[in-house]
Each structure stands twice: as C-alpha cells, then as structure tokens.
C-alpha cells in the first residue's frame, strides 16, 4: 500500500484522496481508520456509514474515493486506509498517516536569571509553553540564532531598551512572545512589572515604575 | 469450501525464532484479509496478527508488536508468521484464519503448536 | 479496548435440554457486531454467529443469538450430543477486537 503523510491543524476541515484515478467498475470501496475499523462504506451504488467517531462528520465522494472529515481533532490522529475490491475480486489500498496538531499557544518569557558580570549585563530568559512539542527561535540583536526554549546573552552597556523575541512553532502554526529590557541591568526587581501581550497591544515587556507610569498616562 | 492447513510449529528456546506458515487450498487467497489467533494451553483465544488481502498493511496484537511479523505470498497462497525474540508465554496452539470482511474470523486451520521452553 | 465477559464459565446439562449463555461487553458494541463460535477439543472454532443474530452458512437453527448494546446471548434450543463444547464470543465493533474467556457446555 501507498502511504502518504498529512499533517493539519485542528478544528480544520480536511479531504483524504488519493492521487491517482480508482480502478475502473470497482464493486466495492472502504474507508477504515487504523486497521480495521471502518468509517464508510460504498457498495452497490450506496453509501453506508459504520457506527464510529466520525459518523455525522464525515462525507464519502464514491467517484473519487475522497473522504471529507469535518473538525478534525487530536484524537484523529490515525493511519486511514481506503480499500478498493476491484471487479477481478481482488483490493488495492492506500493509506494516508493523518496528524493532527493543536495551534501553539502564545509563549510566555520568563527571566530566569539577570545580573552584573564586569560592567555587563548577563541576561538569561526562557520561553515557556504548556506541554508542547514545538520549535524554538529566538530573533533580536543576537551573535547567532537560537533555536531553544533559553536564551542566554551578555549585554555590553547601553542606554536603550533591547528587544528580543521568541517565536514557537509546529508544523501547522507559530506564534511570537516578545521581551524588552531596559537598563540599567541591575534595576530592582520590584521597580519592574511584567506587562501583559494585551496591554502593549502585541508586545510582551519587562519595563521599569516610571515607564510604566508614562505608559498608562498615553 | 477453502482449507486452511498450518506448518512450522514445534519447540523453541526463550529468546529464539520459529516461522509458521498457513497454506491456503480452494480459494482466491489473495481476495482475503487474514490473520493469526492463538490459544495457550488450557485458555481462551487471543487474535496475534492480521494482515490486508493485498499484504500492504499488518496489525498485530501490543503482546508480539516488535517481535512477530505476519506476511503474505499471493503467488504461493502462503501466509506467515515470523516469531523472534520468542517467551515462555507465547507457548500455545497458532491457528491461521481468514479475517473475514475484515470483522470476524472464518474459517480456521486446524493449527500449529509453538512451545517456548528452556 | 472492549472487555467481554462471558458467563457462566460452565454450563452443566442434558440433552435435549435448552443452553443460554451470556457474553457481557464493558462497553457498548458498536452495531451490535459480534460473534459466536464454537470450539471443540482438539479441533478448530467454528463460526456459529455474527452480527449478533445471524447464522453462519450451514449452521443448524438450534443456535441462535440475541442482544444488543452490552447483553448478548446465545441460545440454543435443545442440546444434541455434539453441542458439548466451549463456546466464545468475539466483538469486532472497536479495535482490537476481542474474545470472551469461554463458556463449556458440558454433559450432566
């Protein structure tokens, strides 16, 4: 059997086909999910669906072959096999391996640790989100890229705010948490506040009393 | 009415291998999912492997996944069941059987004896 | 994956007399797909029933299936000597599919 890979994201509607033609007059064509447990059925001129997870979400086209699965989710996740009994009695099948990904949800930057080494500012921040698998990269004023969950940089003086940003990703989605930090770098922690993604419509900041104070006054 | 007549059985050590084939007589084999059913002494029936009347996909049973693989000759009417790393309790009577419509099991070989032993 | 449970596990009467053996599934059978067979010693099972309630070519009418959902129940009517045996069910509604422990019909 052929075996092709998809991948979605959830909640999409999704069309399983094949990309050749089915054989000619078949007598019978069968869609299962895993090995054996069948979704549809097509035989003499009629579609019969099987009591399953996807019945009510699911439509068989008999002249392509092609299975249309509404709102996909996680639990969708399955190798789908169509069979066709040909007229000589024999099957031909095809497999398509469906994966089913949740988009990434927005990351969160958390300062793991921040301090003076020789005049310098040592910054040490990670991305966080919940459970998932995912692909890191982080984007800014940086020697070379990242691409994990922590980002750890040296900061030579400077008397404007660096950004950096993290951005997460699967196959099916990204999303971008951004982090600015503003000197000087030993600024108490409690003279800063984290402002939400929200707030700063898109950003995510770590940013001193009095910018703050500014902030909300604009 | 097809037969279905298993070979291949017989004593092996924990740890080795054994192959069991099913030669199929009076059918069009290759119109015909199959599968392998086992039955330890003494208790009830636990299907092992299945395999698609094409031979293009197999499913076997979480207990021999990694270690058993069920395939197909059409051109010989021959299914098999390969065993490796073979254990104590994967000692039983292996019957082949055609995996009928892909829903029941119909009809059975008479079946193969594997004993695992030391 | 789906448990079946069948009951009693032996069964103990006369010919003649009527059997009703139960097969209990943890979950709903989907479409009420399961089946009987009958097993033996030293031989093969055999198909008796599938979808629930239809016989297998060249079965006799004494056996027949009922049930739906979780309850299903193979009667037969009036045991004949070669009816002695030990009696499975098999659900093919979900994967895997799965066998009941057994009941044996043995003679009184």
């Known amino acids: 059997g052929r075996l092709v890979h998809m991948t979605v994201v959830s909640g999409s509607n999704v069309t399983l086909n094949i990309s050749e033609s089915l054989p000619e007059n078949y007598k019978q064509l069968t869609w299962f999910y895993t090995f054996d447990q069948k979704i549809v059925e097509w035989d003499s001129g009629k579609s019969k669906y099987f009591e399953s997870k996807f019945k009510g979400r699911v439509r068989l086209d008999p002249q392509s072959g092609a299975l249309y699965i509404s709102k996909v989710q996680k639990e969708d996740n399955s190798t789908y096999v169509m069979r066709v009994l040909k007229k000589d009695g024999y099957e031909q099948e095809w497999k398509i391996k469906l994966q089913v990904l949740d988009p990434v949800p927005k990351p969160v930057i958390k300062i793991e640790k921040r301090e003076d080494v020789d005049d310098n500012c040592y910054l040490k921040l990670s991305c966080v989100i919940p459970g998932e698998s995912v692909n890191y990269t982080w984007y800014g004023e940086l020697p070379k890229e990242i691409q994990n969950s922590v980002l750890e940089t040296t900061l030579k003086p400077h008397k404007h705010s660096r950004c950096y940003t993290c951005q997460v990703s699967n196959s099916v989605s990204s999303k971008n948490g951004t982090f600015c930090f503003s000197p000087p770098c030993t600024a108490a922690r409690s003279e800063q506040k984290l402002i939400s993604e929200e707030d700063l419509g898109g950003e995510q900041k770590l940013i001193s009393e009095e910018d703050l104070h500014h902030h909300h006054h604009h | 009415e097809g037969q279905l007549l298993e070979s291949g059985g017989g004593l092996a050590q924990p740890g080795g291998s054994l192959r069991l084939s099913c030669a199929a007589s009076?059918?069009?084999?290759?119109?015909?999912?199959m599968s392998w059913v086992r039955q330890a002494p003494g208790k009830g029936l636990e299907w092992v492997s299945l395999?698609?009347?094409?031979?293009?996909?197999?499913y076997h049973a979480d207990s021999v996944k990694g270690r058993f693989t069920i395939s197909r000759d059409n051109s010989k009417n021959t299914l098999y069941l390969q065993m490796n790393s073979l254990r104590a309790e994967d000692t039983a009577v292996y019957y082949c059987?055609?995996?009928?419509?892909?829903?029941?099991?119909?009809?059975w070989g008479q079946g193969t004896l594997v004993t695992v032993s030391s | 994956e789906i448990v079946l449970t069948q009951s009693p596990g032996t069964l103990s009467l006369s010919p003649g007399e009527r059997a009703t053996l139960s097969c209990r599934a943890s979950?709903?059978?989907?479409?009420?797909?399961l089946a009987w067979y009958q097993q033996k010693p030293g031989q093969a099972p055999r198909l008796l029933i599938y979808?629930?309630?239809s016989r297998a070519t060249d079965i006799p009418d004494r056996f027949s299936g009922s049930g739906s959902g979780t309850d299903f129940t193979l009667t037969i009517s009036r045991l004949e000597p070669e009816d002695f045996a030990v009696y499975y069910c098999q659900q093919y509604g979900s994967s895997p599919r799965t066998f009941g422990q057994g009941t044996k019909v043995e003679i009184k």
């Open positions: 979950q709903s059978v989907s479409s009420n797909y």
């Open positions: 059987a055609i995996y009928n419509n892909y829903n029941w099991f119909d009809p």
């Open positions: 009076g059918i069009t084999f290759g119109r015909y999912a």
């Open positions: 979808d629930a309630s």
């Open positions: 395999i698609s009347g094409s031979g293009g996909s197999t």
